[in-house]
Amino acid sequence: DSEEDEEHTIITDTELPPLKLMHSFCAFKADDGPCKAIMKRFFFNIFTRQCEEFIYGGCEGNQNRFESLEECKKMCTRDNANRIIKTTLQQEKPDFCFLEEDPGICRGYITRYFYNNQTKQCERFKYGGCLGNMNNFETLEECKNICEDGPNGFQVDNYGTQLNAVNNSLTPQSTKVPSLFEFHGPSWCLTPADRGLCRANENRFYYNSVIGKCRPFKYSGCGGNENNFTSKQECLRACKKGFIQRISKGGLIKTKRKRKKQRVKIAYEEIFVKNM
């Protein structure tokens, strides 16, 4: 399977419910590129979950750019509202949720959480500090979000969601105030973790701008993007200092895009990718 055929489960930094994208590039921020032409193009906006118009400079940019509204919709939106609801909420659990709790061969008495497939709940266990398996979460919340079912057999999805009949988009019913960030570091720190196209399973780190931390991910060995570090320290050095958190009192803030050569793509946390 190529990367383009895979669906990605994501959480955006505005705390929308998880969205399954048909293609990973649909999550990229509209990128006008460094050139100065004025060309009308369309991109998929993961905040509004709609295809929207933007002005393209004529060179570089990214794959989230389409000649027509129809092409954008075809590539990045689901045409069936029920299908959107289903794929958004009724996600399959990652395989590692079904692995048994494994403390590993070391003995460090570290409190972690695992999904117990017998009780169908996340539970605490003592992790030894090395090896073990991926059914191992730092927080109960993280474990629940990834492995537990919600009340209707859906994946846990901490936000009520309703279908907006006007534009077929999903509207979050969350009263949570989204935290937004001003970023002054390298643009690649805002890109999603990208496994790439090969078949290796290398331990790497990416900067998760949603939570402001460097997180491990499995790199396929080729492709991907620059948000890819061989150590946590390297990741933190490159990305951590660039963030200034800014709390917004309102809902979503629309910021005016400035023309600049540095390309900043939208930030999201990739929870899991098939074949990881």
Epitope: P103, G128, G129, C130
Partner: antibody, heavy 123, light 112 residues
């Protein structure tokens, strides 16, 4: 002082099962501060980890993918030992086999090794 | 699998002189809880391997202080400050960041 004493045949015929035992003194196979492993060494492959067992709230085992379909490591709590069984052997399984203790507490590593058993697979 | 690559494969040394062995991992050995998941072993001629350095830089009990381990990420080094005749043998690095546990191919240290 922990000591690991290996025993088992040095010659095994192809397609048969290689069986080795590692007797533990100075520690317990059921200890929650140790794990017990088999590692082999051959000129072609160097040191190759085969698998490990350990007891915490229950028994766990992990095996190398290269031998996963053929290997079993079992504890014997009554004799305070653990064993290796490797099925359907071929001449490529010819190696010196070591049992080793993984120290789980402060010193995370294979801190005690058996004396090694040269196993030749040949008809 | 994480591949551990050692260099040099052979190291002729002079007693009293320093020696250094490099070990590179194909993936970063994640440093969690301040621990580097890498060990060093010495296999003396005709013997089983013995643990020298654990968690990247800690000497195992009974190991002389002329041995030291350092490094992080993918690059690690074992140093012997002043080689002694009893230090000859094959040195191996080993990772326990992920299964399967893997060893380097070994560095043979011999007296010139």
């Amino acid at each position: 002082q922990v000591q690991l004493q290996q025993s088992g045949p040095g010659l095994v015929k192809p397609s048969q099962t290689l069986s080795l035992t590692c007797a533990i003194s100075g520690d317990s196979v059921s200890s929650d501060s140790a794990a017990w492993s088999w590692i082999r060494q051959s000129p072609g492959r160097g040191l190759e980890w085969l698998g490990i067992i350990y007891k915490r709230s229950k028994w766990y085992n992990r095996y190398a993918v290269s031998v996963k379909s053929r290997i079993t490591i079992n504890p014997d709590t009554s004799k305070n030992q653990f064993s290796l069984q490797l099925n359907s052997v071929t001449p490529e399984d010819t190696a010196v086999y070591y049992c080793a203790r993984w120290h789980s507490d402060k010193m995370w590593g294979f801190d005690d090794w058996g004396q090694g058993t040269l196993v030749t697979v040949s008809s | 699998d994480i591949v551990m690559t050692q260099s040099p494969l052979s190291l002729p040394v002079t007693p009293g002189e320093p020696a250094s062995i490099s070990c590179r991992s194909s993936q970063s050995l994640v440093m969690s809880f301040g621990i580097t998941y890498l060990n060093w072993y010495l296999q003396k001629p005709g013997q089983s391997p013995q643990l020298l350095i654990y968690k990247g830089s800690n000497r195992a009990s009974g190991v002389p202080d002329r041995f030291s381990g350092s490094g992080s990420g993918t690059d690690f080094t074992l140093k012997i400050s002043r080689v002694e005749a009893e230090d000859v043998g094959v040195y191996y690095c080993q990772q326990y960041d992920s299964y399967p546990l893997t060893f380097g191919q070994g560095t043979k240290v011999e007296i010139k």
